[in-house]
């Protein structure tokens, strides 16, 4: 079964995935695709990544994290209710059918009204909390739980947080990442 | 023109070796994944090895599992496949083809290795 | 792995007739099966991909459906280049695995 993950209609959307690189600069080839992991590398390829760049990458979908680092979460960016469904993040580890692969499953919620200027927009739907551990058969899941209530003024503190991949660095430093080498 | 070349088959010895090689052309060779597909006389298609772009991450059938080996030079367009501790089930013909996007979309002619004694 | 069980195994008909060629997989492979068509002493060529996809430059008379276990090849008219033996194949756990093939045969 899938990890899940959501998100609504015109906010961007977040699928974390993570290595730790063997060393500084060792970076193994990754790629994201649209649809389940096939056999061998990614179908419906929508960005790929090889030992030191990002070398392909198709309009709204881009690492927000440092991918130098092993942060190879994916952002969506202004997402539609097409971009619902399944997403494959492979893991390209050297060696004899070392990949490590993991299916996300993206689900697009309306847009919600906002009768007021004030209200909370929910931070926690669009970036939930949760991580990839390590398997090797269909992708395992932790929840960290969810984010705590937070008040207008922390909202730009957290979008900054995300655009920093700070979060992401939380989630790597929780130690739940793939570590080669 | 796109091709692949198959070249190295032959006649061996059950127990021998033989080293088989696609020639890529007309396209970039590094890119893609590479596979090699056999058929035995009068059988189906088997999949037997698959190699990465970067020719770092490699996958064999449970049939040829420490006795083949899958490997790629970029420079020079090149694939092979390595076979060592050949038996007689081992007698196909062996084609090279390239991966893309979950389906094997191009195929060399195709060598035919027998394991006779 | 997973086993692909395509039928019939062989196949006669006649040059304008539509034939069908079913592909059944063991398990869910969602949209991840392609067809291949061989003609004797050649190698395989894609028709079609991710269940539907048809590849550049294959006569539109082909079609593929499906999705999950159960898949078809679809030849709308058979044309004389078309008697061959037809391959379906799943791309999605590792092995990928073929089916045994069905071999259409004029007659």
């Known amino acids: 079964s899938e990890v899940e993950y959501r998100a609504e209609v015109g906010q961007n959307a977040y699928l974390p995935c993570f290595y730790t690189p063997a060393a500084p600069g060792n970076l193994v080839p990754v790629c994201w695709g649209k649809g389940a992991c096939p056999v061998f590398e990614c179908g419906n390829v929508v960005l790929r990544t090889d030992e030191r760049d990002v070398n392909y990458w198709t309009s709204r979908y881009w690492l927000n994290g440092d991918f130098r680092k092993g942060d190879v979460s994916l952002t969506i960016e202004n997402v539609t209710l097409a971009d619902s469904g399944i997403y494959c993040c492979r893991i390209q580890i050297p060696g004899i059918m070392n990949d490590e692969k993991f299916n996300l499953k993206l689900v697009i919620k309306p847009a919600k009204v906002t009768p007021a200027p004030t209200r909370q927009r929910d931070f926690t739907a669009a970036f939930p909390r949760m991580l990839t551990t390590r398997g090797h058969g269909p992708a395992e899941t932790q929840t960290l739980g969810s984010l705590p209530d937070i008040n207008l003024t922390q909202i730009s503190t957290l979008a900054n947080e995300l655009r920093d991949s700070r979060l992401a660095n939380d989630l790597r430093d929780s130690g739940a990442t793939i570590r080669i080498g | 023109e796109v091709q692949l070349l198959e070249s190295g088959g032959g006649l061996v010895q059950p127990g021998g070796s033989l080293r088989l090689s696609c020639a890529a052309s007309g396209f970039t060779f590094s890119s893609y994944y590479m596979s090699w597909v056999r058929q035995a006389p009068g059988k189906g298609l088997e999949w037997v090895s698959a190699?990465?772009?970067?020719?770092?991450?490699?996958y064999y059938a449970d049939s040829v599992k420490g006795r083949f080996t899958i490997s790629r030079d970029n420079s020079k367009n090149t694939l092979y496949l390595q076979m060592n501790s050949l038996r007689a089930e081992d007698t196909a013909v062996y084609y090279c083809?390239?991966?893309?996007?979950?389906?094997?979309?191009?195929w060399g002619q195709g060598t035919l290795v027998t394991v006779s004694s | 792995d997973i086993v692909m069980t395509q039928s019939p195994s062989s196949l006669s008909a006649s040059v304008g007739d539509g034939v069908t060629i079913t592909c059944q997989a063991s398990q869910d492979i969602y949209n991840y099966l392609n067809w291949y068509q061989q003609k004797p002493g050649k190698a395989p060529k894609l028709l079609i991909y991710y269940a539907s996809s048809i590849v550049s430059g294959v006569p539109s008379r082909f079609s593929g459906s499906g999705s999950g276990t159960d898949f078809t090849l679809t030849i709308s008219s058979l044309q004389p280049e078309d008697f061959a033996t037809y391959y379906c194949q799943q791309a999605s756990s590792f092995p990928p695995t073929f089916g045994q093939g069905t071999k259409l045969e004029i007659k």
């Open positions: 083809a390239r991966y893309y996007n979950t389906g094997f979309d191009l």
């Open positions: 190699i990465s772009g970067n020719g770092k991450s490699t």
